[in-house]
């Protein structure tokens, strides 16, 4: 067909340390030579469909699927993945070919599947099909568990697509708040994939293998709890399953629960209800809202209502890629030697992050705590009052985040001295950075009060040891002071320290600390 455009489909593999990837989803920089994917016309298909060669990608690899269109005039386009439309921004290269790119950062199971690209040019419309799968490598993986409803039963199945096969356990707790901590006596663990008892206060599923342990909590709105000031928020990525449980207890069975999304009742097949009598004969009802594979239009306010309880809502936000939101500006702190102090980073992230704190090339475990407002916080208190640069690093499947902190400890200077044949130097790491004086000790000035100003060279922040500033002062030797004792003094707002040096002919120098 003469009218059909010339189409080239390519795969660009990005190196993992490629800093250019993800800076712009429209124009990723090529880090390896593009691999031609063919893009042949698919026979016997209704409409014009091009099919690219199947793409196999390593777990966590970053790739770009790119289409080059040699067709006159403007083009418009739309990507579709798992029934969701994704942004598409065509641009033109130097040869005036239309270029459409889809960047996949850190490939995961949920990003595998068919990517359809619909292109409309002035002459014709056509579709390009990419099939992306994860290469079957022996790489170990540990994926966050997700829930599915058991066929024809009121039960949940917990699934974690991990290698090696993980041990799956349900972690149940029937009390509130702090007492639901992992090792609390209120916590019950069940090492099985299917859970029938779905009325508990707190329900989590965990999967563990050689790589560690990942857990997912069953998101719950409890209508018997006083409505929170902050609306709970749930993030999910396109293609992931959505599960929200609404729970209510009342003195009798005379009440019902309903779910609405943006004030429209959920369609049948997107919810199921269970009820039971508790030990004190009150009625417990739970109503699950679920979507097996979410799309962008599942975003919104999900409201659970009851005739006998105040309504409550949760904001569900569906994102195309995971994220870490936090301020990455570096922060400087100045504390006293015995002052209690913790670094802290407040962030919002999905999926949950893995993080580390680093100081002096040593990594420390990182704990995160969820706050009521949808944010999480990580604190680091184990600095042992060592001044320097501390680094917080966080990452999830799709995003990375680094924040730098500098810790300065207010203290009186400590002075160290060294000398050579031509000069004497003094060093101090006190904070605030000290100022220096040099004094000459002689018969005229036995208390060393005669100030030396000539030949003195001060260097602030001479070297940086893991963020710890060191100040130095050097005295160039002259005939006028050779053979004399000199005293260098470092002083700041917290005090003064001095060191006395005998400036004799070359050889070892005696130092006398004089605080």
């Amino acid at each position: 067909n003469q009218d059909l455009p010339v189409i080239k489909c390519v795969l660009i593999n990005h190196k993992n340390n490629d800093s250019s990837v993800g800076k712009s989803s429209s124009y990723p920089m090529v880090s390896e030579s593009p691999e031609d994917l063919g893009c042949a016309l698919r026979p016997q298909s209704s409409g014009t469909v091009y099919e690219a060669a199947a793409v196999e990608v390593d777990v966590s690899a970053s790739i770009t699927l790119q289409v080059l269109v040699d067709a006159p005039g403007n083009i418009s386009c739309l990507w579709v993945f798992k029934h969701s439309s994704l942004n598409c921004q065509p641009h033109f290269d130097l040869q005036n070919r239309g270029v459409v790119s889809m960047v996949i950062l850190k490939m995961t199971e949920t990003q595998a599947g068919e990517y359809l690209l619909f292109i409309q040019s002035e002459a014709t419309n056509y579709t390009i099909l990419f099939t992306v799968s994860i290469r079957n490598t022996l790489l170990y993986t540990l994926r966050r568990p997700y829930f599915r409803k058991m066929e024809n039963q009121d039960a949940l199945v917990c699934i974690s697509e991990s290698v090696p096969e993980p041990i799956v356990e349900w972690v149940l707790c029937d009390s509130q708040g702090e007492s639901c901590k992992e090792e609390s006596p209120a916590v019950v663990k069940k090492e099985e994939k299917v859970l029938h008892e779905l009325f508990g206060t707190d329900i989590r599923c965990c999967a563990r293998n050689e790589l560690g342990r990942e857990c997912t909590r069953l998101f719950t709105i409890d209508l018997n709890q006083t409505p929170q000031t902050t609306l709970p928020q749930l993030f999910l990525k396109v293609g992931e399953p959505l599960w929200i449980r609404c729970k209510a207890v009342h003195v009798n069975h005379g009440f019902g629960l309903t779910w609405e999304l943006e004030n429209k009742a959920l369609e049948e097949g997107n919810y199921f209800e269970m009820s039971t009598y508790s030990t004190n004969r009150t009625m417990i009802r739970i109503l699950f809202a679920f979507v097996s594979s979410v799309a962008r239009n599942d975003t919104g306010y999900y409201t659970c209502s009851s005739s006998k309880h105040p309504s409550q809502s949760a904001l569900v936000t569906i994102v195309e890629k995971g994220f870490i939101n936090a301020t990455n500006s570096s922060e400087d702190y100045e504390i006293d030697q015995y002052e209690e102090f913790c670094f802290s980073v407040r962030f919002k992230a999905y999926p949950q992050i893995r993080c580390t704190w680093t100081f002096s090339r040593k990594s420390f475990p990182c704990e995160q705590k969820g706050l009521d407002n949808g944010y999480s916080i990580s604190k680091f208190c184990n600095h042992k009052h060592q001044p320097g640069e501390y680094i917080f690093h966080a990452e999830n499947d799709d995003a990375q985040f680094t924040k730098m902190f500098t810790l300065n400890i207010r203290r009186k200077p400590q002075v160290l001295a060294e000398a050579s044949a031509s000069q004497a130097s003094c060093f101090s790491d006190g904070y605030p950075l000290p100022s220096w004086t040099w004094k000459k000790c002689s018969d005229k000035s036995p208390n060393c009060t005669e100030e030396i100003t000539e030949g003195v060279w001060n260097r602030k922040a001479n070297r940086k040891v893991f963020g710890q500033w060191v100040s130095s002062s050097t005295l160039n030797m002259s005939e006028a002071i050779k053979g004399f004792l000199v005293k260098c003094c470092a002083y700041n707002s917290l005090g003064t320290s001095c060191e006395t040096i005998l400036l004799n002919s070359p050889g070892p120098f005696p130092f006398i600390q004089d605080n």
Partner: nanobody, 111 residues
Framework: QVQLQESGGGLVQAGGSLRLSCAAS????????IDWYRQAPGKQREWVAQ???????FYADSVKGRFAISRDNAKNTVYLQMNNLKPEDTAVYYC?????WGQGTQVTVSS
Amino acid sequence: QVQLQESGGGLVQAGGSLRLSCAASGVTFSINYIDWYRQAPGKQREWVAQITRDSNSFYADSVKGRFAISRDNAKNTVYLQMNNLKPEDTAVYYCRVLSYWGQGTQVTVSS
């Protein structure tokens, strides 16, 4: 853009009454439930009352029997009638629809 505007606050003697209003714009008012919250100086914001789409009302234990919530869908307004006020009712009162909050109106009850 959803906007909520409270009014009707003021200074009142213990045992007296006030009627607060919450006027909403930019929201299909008749299909949302609306909450009143309050925040006393130095305390956390606390839930006070709710009225649902079909005019079911719910109250915090501390105000049951003294406060009454109502709505006028034609005027896109919710009211909080506060009777037998006590000094501990002193607070800034806010109305809320989903994630949206008003600016608040100050209620001061003197003894």
